[in-house]
């Protein structure tokens, strides 16, 4: 591209070229993929509603937990055991969470009366011990309550501890009470307020509207906008037995997704609830099942401090608001409809590729011979070659060869190193199709040439005989008519090509070859065709009129204007061109590739 | 689960060497602090030698010097190389596992019984000349 553009360049339009291709099975291709993409886009235009632009909520949610709870505990006082009845109420079950969530006591264990002393550890396998071996001075292991002595005292009857400063008695470790001392915290309910903000589309709503009965219970389908939900029915909507979660306690996910159109004509905002178990409950037992949590209750009894240690397990609920607010926007519908254009394109991309695929060499040497049915087919061959233009990368070693008795064209893309052209095999390439329209513009007296005597009015292209060998003839020649190459030794096997592949006849003794390539009537009406007022001297108009009858050798041999400027002429073709139209002085120069 | 076979025992005279080996099931091995026990008749169970998963080592105070333990992971064994052997070292040996997957054994823990979860059925050996 040049480096410097004037305003004309600027101001232009480049366009593509098409093939129209009339075909009943490639039209119904075509409607096919146009009317099934057309319904797609649509039907995910509306569903989606791609045309909103959709905005994620902010929320803040409140929750009120309501209930009561009567509690058997079992404790021993004096070495007997007693059941003592207890109320709880939402002070003594609720605990204050941060973020979106709220917790329930559902179990508990306690360790009354702890003080500050040193008393012997709970046996467990990491704190018996057999001496004071067993146990090291200032040890504080993770899972021990206290600081180790560093001796060995009885804990209770024969079995020895490791003694440590620590709250005494130590927390027994034990597993939680079954049923969970709380079980009838399934009844409990739960209030939970959700304000939600869309600023984008500045809407506000919550889920609480102001005609609601505040004496509803959720149920997922007789009251799926009610904002107070029982316990134990979170559980069931999950699969889950809240006596069972209960003793060991568990996390639960309470989801509230909010799904709003806020167009006009189709407005709806409001919070669909869902209900997920969230903690792992097939965690085995040392890896630490359920939820909890320990906290004291401080107290002084005689000037000592002293506190009350609960276990607490229980269920942490953890509010989950989620969703979009959407609404129409001119914008995102362009950047849709823009982004869905590009499927209109399928058709295309597969009908191209059936052409290709059906217009294979595959196909033409593999299937067509021997599927009948697939016959049809063959059509793909002339809808490619009219939609295809191939061409080669004109490579320096690029050249074209066509012999009088061969139908194709050979390509030789190769360097010769040092053998005749004549003899290199090269690559079969079909002779483009004869465009007659040309002959159109040669002048009258080409078309109506009168019949020479002694030669029959019909089409004779060659004489039969072959013309003898000469004695100068080189090897490579086949008519008799070639000469050895005057270029230099290196350049020489580019010139060694005869006009056929085997003996016979040549082309130069053709009538054709005649009026064709070497009548100076039809080579100068050619030059003054492309310029009219041409004038020159002998010898420029020599060299003019050679090269003009090598361009129509080559023109009227290959064809196609790509193939005619790589071809090499036959030895004796050119040989007779510079015999008619020779050079008053120098050497000829041979082909030169033109780029 | 962890199951412990020891091998090697028998009868030997003073002073010379025997080799006993523990050989353990579960592809879990490496996680195990393994140690050696022995019992003579009518004592309590004694410490001889453990191996943290790690490869720390602890011996009893009548052995050390004399007894060697080792381990091999790929192997799933825990040898006890005993040299200089004495007619005091007359007892059943016994062969025990302590999980380490949560946590690792105190090095000054490696010695207590209560420690070790695991426990195999014992080898004679008999020092006398």
């Known amino acids: 591209m040049p480096a410097c553009c004037s305003c004309s360049d600027v101001f232009q339009y480049e366009t593509n070229k098409v093939t129209r291709i009339q075909s009943m099975n490639y039209g119904t291709i075509k409607w096919f993929f146009h009317v099934i993409i057309f319904s797609y886009v649509c039907f995910a235009l509306v569903s989606d509603k791609l045309y909103q632009r959709k905005e994620p909520v902010i929320s803040s949610v409140h929750t009120k937990v309501k209930g009561i709870a009567e509690v058997k505990e079992e404790i021993v006082e004096n070495g007997v055991k007693k059941l003592v009845h207890s109320v709880f109420d939402t002070a003594d079950y609720t605990f204050p969470l941060q973020g979106n969530s709220f917790f329930v006591m559902t179990n508990f264990l306690k360790t009354e009366g702890q003080e500050q002393r040193l008393c012997p550890e709970y046996p467990t396998r990491r704190t018996l011990c057999s001496s004071d071996r067993g146990c090291k001075k200032g040890w504080m292991d993770p899972q021990s309550k206290g600081i180790q002595t560093g001796r060995c005292v009885v804990y209770e009857g024969n079995q020895k501890t490791c003694e440590v400063s620590a709250w005494c008695p130590i927390e027994a470790v034990e597993e939680a009470p079954r049923p969970a001392l709380l079980n009838s915290a399934e009844n409990f309910t739960v209030l939970i307020k959700n304000n939600i903000d869309f600023p984008g589309h500045n809407y506000t709503t919550r889920n609480i509207l102001p005609g609601l009965n505040i004496t509803c219970t959720f149920h997922k389908t007789q009251n799926p906008q009610c904002p107070i939900f029982r316990l134990g029915d979170i559980f069931r909507e999950t699969g889950d037995n809240f006596s069972d979660v209960a003793i060991q306690g568990g996390i639960m996910g309470i989801e509230i997704y909010w799904d709003c159109n806020l167009d006009r004509w189709f407005h709806h905002c409001r919070p669909k609830y869902s209900f997920r178990r969230l903690d792992d409950k097939t965690t085995n037992v040392s890896l630490y099942p359920g939820y909890n949590f320990r906290y004291a209750k401080y107290y002084k009894e005689n000037n000592v401090e002293k506190r009350t240690l609960i276990k607490v397990f229980g269920i942490r609920f953890d509010i989950l608001v989620f969703g979009t607010g959407g609404k129409f926007d001119i914008i995102q519908l362009v950047v849709y409809i823009g982004s869905t254009l590009s499927y209109f394109g399928l058709a295309a991309v597969f009908i191209d590729f059936l052409i290709d695929t059906y217009s294979s060499n595959c196909c033409r040497s593999h299937i067509y011979p021997w599927c009948k049915c697939c016959q049809p087919c063959v059509v793909n061959e002339y809808y490619y070659r009219k939609k295809c233009e191939s061409i080669v990368e004109p490579k320096p070693t690029l050249k074209y060869v066509s012999f009088v008795d061969e139908s194709h064209i050979r390509m030789v893309n190769q360097q010769l190193l040092g053998r005749s052209l004549q003899d290199v095999k090269g690559q079969e390439v079909p002779r483009p199709a004869m465009d007659f329209t040309d002959l159109s513009r040669l002048p009258l007296a080409l078309h109506d040439t009168p019949p020479i005597p002694g030669q029959p009015e019909e089409i004779q292209l060659l004489r039969k005989e072959a013309t003898p060998r000469s004695r100068d003839s080189p090897v490579w020649c086949q008519c008799g008519s070639c000469l050895p190459s005057q270029l230099p030794e290196s350049h020489r096997c580019l010139e060694e090509l005869c006009c056929r592949k085997k003996p016979g006849a040549c082309i130069t003794t053709s009538e054709l070859f005649r009026k064709l390539v070497l009548s100076r009537h039809v080579l100068q009406f050619l030059l003054l065709y492309q310029e009219p007022l041409l004038a020159l001297d002998v010898d420029s108009t020599n060299s003019r009129l050679r090269h003009c009858a090598y361009r129509c050798y080559a023109t009227w041999r290959f064809g196609s204007q790509d193939m005619a400027d790589f071809a090499i002429l036959p030895s004796c073709c050119r040989w007779r061109i510079r015999k008619e139209f020779p050079k008053s002085e120098g050497q000829y120069s041979g082909f030169k590739s033109p780029y | 689960e962890v199951q412990l076979v020891e091998s090697g025992g028998g009868v030997v005279q003073p002073g010379g060497s025997l080799r006993l080996s523990c050989a353990a099931s579960?592809?879990?091995?490496?996680?195990?602090?393994m140690g050696w026990f022995r019992q003579a008749p009518g004592k309590e169970r004694e410490f001889v030698a453990a191996?943290?998963?790690?490869?720390?080592?602890d011996y009893g105070d009548s052995v050390k010097g004399r007894f060697t333990i080792s381990r091999d992971d790929a192997k799933n064994t825990v040898p006890l190389q005993m040299n200089s052997l004495k007619p005091e070292d007359t007892a059943v040996y016994y062969c025990?596992?302590?999980?380490?997957?949560?946590?690792?054994?105190?090095?000054?823990?490696?010695?207590?019984?209560?420690?070790?979860?695991?426990w195999g059925q014992g080898t004679l050996v008999t020092v006398k000349s």
């Open positions: 025990a596992a302590a999980d380490e997957t949560l946590g690792a054994v105190p090095n000054f823990r490696l010695h207590e019984k209560y420690e070790y979860e695991y």
């Open positions: 579960g592809r879990t091995f490496r996680h195990y602090a």
């Open positions: 191996i943290s998963s790690y490869g720390s080592t």
